[in-house]
Structures are given as structure tokens and as C-alpha cells.
């Protein structure tokens, strides 16, 4: 065991800060993009390097759920991820450099609201603080737009098709084709929160398919064709 | 006591890769950084990178960004770098070094020896 | 990318005596947080480098209080009173401000 082989830290006798918290009021991001909420502190215990958490919470200071939590090791660098919500949170300072900022990923328009920093040190130090305030993060909507659309081989020499789009609120899809009456059925499915897939699964005829991408912000559409030339199976798109 | 224990000398051909060992032992290895540092005979000391043991926080050198590739297995408190494309000039002794700051021990060093 | 810089390739010092070694950085090492991210090694002929101050003026665990580092936000001295014959080899110095971590060409102290 390490623990008894630990540096000394010279004593320094420049004047003590207090605790403080650094956030801005407001961060603003667009649902499905990334953002980074910034929090950077000062504290009294000048060469502190015993053992420290970083906590992010959401809702409330002091009593919200927690979305974020890391723990670092006396005389570490690395903060090591003992909670992110979802998978989606990520710590971006280093907290043994006074940086508690975060990023959050995916964003969704429910993850809206206010999110609190804390760091404690739970060693010899035993101290702790906490963001009273918080930052606010705005989530806006956003319009459809179509990530991929695709044309894969299916069974017996079958074609079928893929459109995936991503927006907030999730978009309707919807595919048009040559076949009989120009509009195809299509297996709407559920992607990952903001993102929602849509398969037609027999393209029957040669031609353009078109995949039409909408929520209450607009629409988006593209579109894949489809040649099979001398009965050979094989796409043009 | 902390202990990092390297893999043994190594000698490879031009355009070779090669696959190097850092094992820890005496402390809890998924607490701290390894870092990894080059130093060619009779020169002195250049920093490669260095990894956390979930291998997703990793950090390059841009220098040695093409040339090595840091890997971490928790399991058997083992850091590795794989140095690949090697040309004379990746002729060196490289370290491990890892604990408190990430640099209070050092590996004892691994001659990589680059020859047709 | 942070140059160091060690204008010393070497220091004759008699043993029982003091030297200085001095490094300087092309910016400040000085952090916001009041802390100056800069490291003293030696390297001791055939071995591995050995940590002796961390932060500019921290001795690490081990290392005898003959040592001692101090320095502004960019010149820094790392002195070593009472010369041992033990003392020889290379000393480094090294910033871990920012990425790329940056060694200085090293000082090599030899025994008079």
C-alpha cells in the first residue's frame, strides 16, 4: 500500500483566498448539439492535494439529483467518473486546477433548467462548496434535418431503404416513391432521443425515393435512387 | 512500495512496430495518469503522452501523435505504447512513470533499438 | 508549445559546497490557482530520472532538505547545498503548465 508515501508540501505564506464559485448565468444550446457549462473556484487551502469529489446536480443547490460526480485521488490528476446520467456528462477542467467545467452531450430539450457545481475535499482539509446560484442551461428546439439516408441490400436480391433524422421535437418521417400512388409505407422507428429512424423496406421500383423530415420548426428532405441496370442487382445514388 | 516494472529490451527492424509493457504495482493503478517519456542515447527527455486507465482520457504529444499509440488494461495494472513505422530515429530508452503528479516513480526503462 | 530553457550544459561544483541550477520557461508557469507548474528531475548516470520538487518549490517525498526550488513565473533556480558526491548526474527541469509537458536540455553537475 501506497498511502504512507505521500509528498510534503511546503508551507507558503502568501494570504489564504476564500471559497468562492465562478459560472456564467446562462448557457444557451441547440437540442442534439453539445454544451459546456463552465465552473472554476478558488478556496483557502492554497497546496491542497489530498483526496477531492466534483459533484454536478441539476434542479436545486445542496439537494438536487446529482448528474455528474468524479473523485480524485490525493496527488492526482485524474478526476475518475464514479456518475454520469445517461452516459452524457463529462468532465472537462481539472479539478485539482480549479476547473469543475462540464460538458453535456446530446442535449435534449428536458435537459433545460439549472445545474449546480461542488467540489469537496475529504481529506486532512475536510471542506466543501457548492455553486448557490447555478448555471442555466436554455435547450432550444430545433428543425429536422437528415443526418443519413441510405439504400441497403435486403433479402432475394431486395433493396431497402434508410433515412435517419434528428431534430427537437423529434421529427415525423415520411418516404415518397415511385411506386403506385407515390407514397410508400415506411417502419417508423425510435433512435436515440432526438434522432428517429425510418425504413422502407422493399423498394420495388427503379427511381427516386424522397425522405421528408418534419416537426412544428420545418422540414427537411432528401432523396437516394435507385438503378438496377441488366437485371443485375446494384444501385445508383 | 510503488513499483513500475518494464518490459525488456527490444530489437526490431525498420517499418516495424513494437508493443511495450508498464506494469504498476504498490498502489491503486486506476487513480493516476502514466505517463510515457522518450530519451534517445546521450540526449535528454521528451514527452510522449500519457493515459488513465480507462484509456479514455489520453493526451499525445503532437510529435508522437502518427508514431505511438497509449493502451491501459485495468485488470492487470498494465500501461502499454506501441510504436509503429519505426525508423532510426525512434532509436531510444522509453519510460513509464506514474503515482503522485503523475511522475513521483519511474520505470526502470525499456531500450527499443531500431536495426535492419 | 512551452520552451525551457537550461543555459548551463553543465556546473563544476566542489563536494560540500552549494550550486545553483537555473532553467527558464518562454511563459509564465503561474497558474490562476497561485500555483507554478514546473518540476526538478536528476538522472543519475544509468538510471532513471528521480522527482525532486514539484510545483517549483515542493520537495518531494524522500529527497533530502539539501534541496530546494524557487523561481519567478518563468526563471527558476533549483539549489542544492552541502554537494554530495551522490549529487552527479543530469538535472531537468520541466513544465506541466500545458500540452505538450516540456523538459528544459538538462544541467549536468560534475564533481570538481
Known amino acids: 500500500d501506497a498511502s504512507g508515501d505521500l509528498l510534503n508540501t511546503e508551507a507558503h505564506s502568501a494570504p489564504a483566498q476564500r471559497w468562492s464559485m465562478q459560472v456564467p448565468a446562462e448557457v444557451n444550446a441547440e437540442a442534439g448539439d453539445a454544451a459546456v457549462l463552465p465552473c472554476t473556484f478558488t478556496h483557502p487551502h492554497r497546496h491542497y492535494d489530498g483526496p477531492l469529489t466534483a459533484i454536478w446536480r441539476s434542479g436545486e443547490p445542496y439537494a438536487g439529483p446529482q448528474v455528474f460526480r468524479c473523485t480524485a485521488a490525493p496527488g492526482s490528476e485524474l478526476c475518475q467518473t464514479a456518475l454520469s446520467l445517461h452516459g452524457r456528462f463529462r468532465l472537462l477542467g481539472n479539478p485539482r486546477r480549479n476547473d469543475l467545467s462540464l460538458r453535456v452531450e446530446r442535449l435534449a430539450l428536458a435537459d433545460s433548467g439549472r445545474y449546480f457545481c461542488r467540489v469537496e475535499f475529504t481529506g486532512d482539509a475536510h471542506d466543501r462548496y457548492e455553486s448557490r446560484h447555478g448555471v442555466r442551461l436554455r435547450v432550444t428546439a430545433a428543425a429536422p434535418r437528415i443526418v443519413n439516408i441510405s439504400v441497403l441490400p435486403g433479402p432475394a436480391h431486395a433493396f431497402r431503404a434508410l433515412c435517419t433524422a434528428e431534430g427537437e421535437p423529434p421529427p415525423a418521417l415520411a418516404w415518397s416513391g415511385p411506386a403506385p400512388g407515390n407514397s410508400s409505407a415506411a417502419l417508423q422507428g425510435q433512435g436515440h432521443g432526438y434522432q428517429v429512424t425510418a425504413e422502407l423496406p422493399a423498394l420495388t421500383r427503379d427511381g427516386r425515393y424522397t425522405c421528408t423530415a418534419a416537426n412544428s420548426l420545418g422540414r427537411a428532405e432528401a432523396s437516394v435512387y435507385l438503378f438496377r441496370f441488366h437485371g443485375a442487382p446494384g444501385t445508383s445514388t | 512500495q510503488v513499483q513500475l516494472k518494464q518490459s525488456g529490451a527490444e530489437l526490431v527492424k525498420p517499418g516495424a512496430s513494437v508493443k511495450i509493457s508498464c506494469k504498476a504495482s504498490?498502489?491503486?493503478?486506476?487513480?493516476?495518469?502514466v505517463n510515457w517519456v522518450k530519451q534517445r542515447p546521450g540526449q535528454g527527455l521528451e514527452w510522449i503522452g500519457k493515459?488513465?486507465?480507462?484509456?479514455?482520457?489520453?493526451y499525445y504529444s503532437e510529435k508522437f501523435k502518427a508514431k505511438a499509440t497509449l493502451t491501459a488494461d485495468k485488470s492487470s495494472s498494465t500501461a502499454y505504447m506501441q510504436l509503429s513505422s519505426l525508423t532510426s530515429e525512434d532509436s531510444a530508452v522509453y519510460f513509464c512513470?506514474?503515482?503522485?503528479?503523475?511522475?513521483?516513480?519511474w520505470g526502470q526503462g525499456t531500450l527499443v533499438t531500431v536495426s535492419a | 508549445d512551452i520552451v525551457m530553457t537550461q543555459a548551463a550544459p553543465s556546473v563544476p561544483v566542489t563536494p560540500g559546497e552549494s550550486v545553483s541550477i537555473s532553467c527558464r520557461s518562454s511563459?509564465?508557469?503561474?497558474?490562476?490557482?497561485?500555483?507554478?507548474?514546473l518540476y526538478w528531475f536528476l538522472q543519475r548516470p544509468g538510471q532513471s530520472p528521480q522527482l525532486l520538487i514539484y510545483r517549483m518549490s515542493n520537495l518531494a517525498s524522500g529527497v533530502p532538505d539539501r534541496f530546494g526550488g524557487s523561481g519567478s513565473g518563468t526563471a527558476f533556480t533549483l539549489r542544492i547545498s552541502r554537494v554530495e558526491a551522490e549529487d552527479v548526474g543530469v538535472y531537468y527541469c520541466?513544465?506541466?503548465?500545458?500540452?505538450?509537458?516540456?523538459f528544459g536540455g538538462g544541467t549536468k553537475l560534475e564533481i570538481k
Open positions: 511563459k509564465s508557469l503561474l497558474h490562476s490557482n497561485g500555483n507554478t507548474y
Open positions: 504498490g498502489y491503486t493503478f486506476t487513480d493516476y495518469y
Open positions: 520541466m513544465q506541466h503548465l500545458e500540452y505538450p509537458y516540456t
Open positions: 493515459i488513465g486507465p480507462e484509456s479514455v482520457s489520453i
Open positions: 512513470a506514474s503515482y503522485y503528479y503523475g511522475f513521483a516513480y
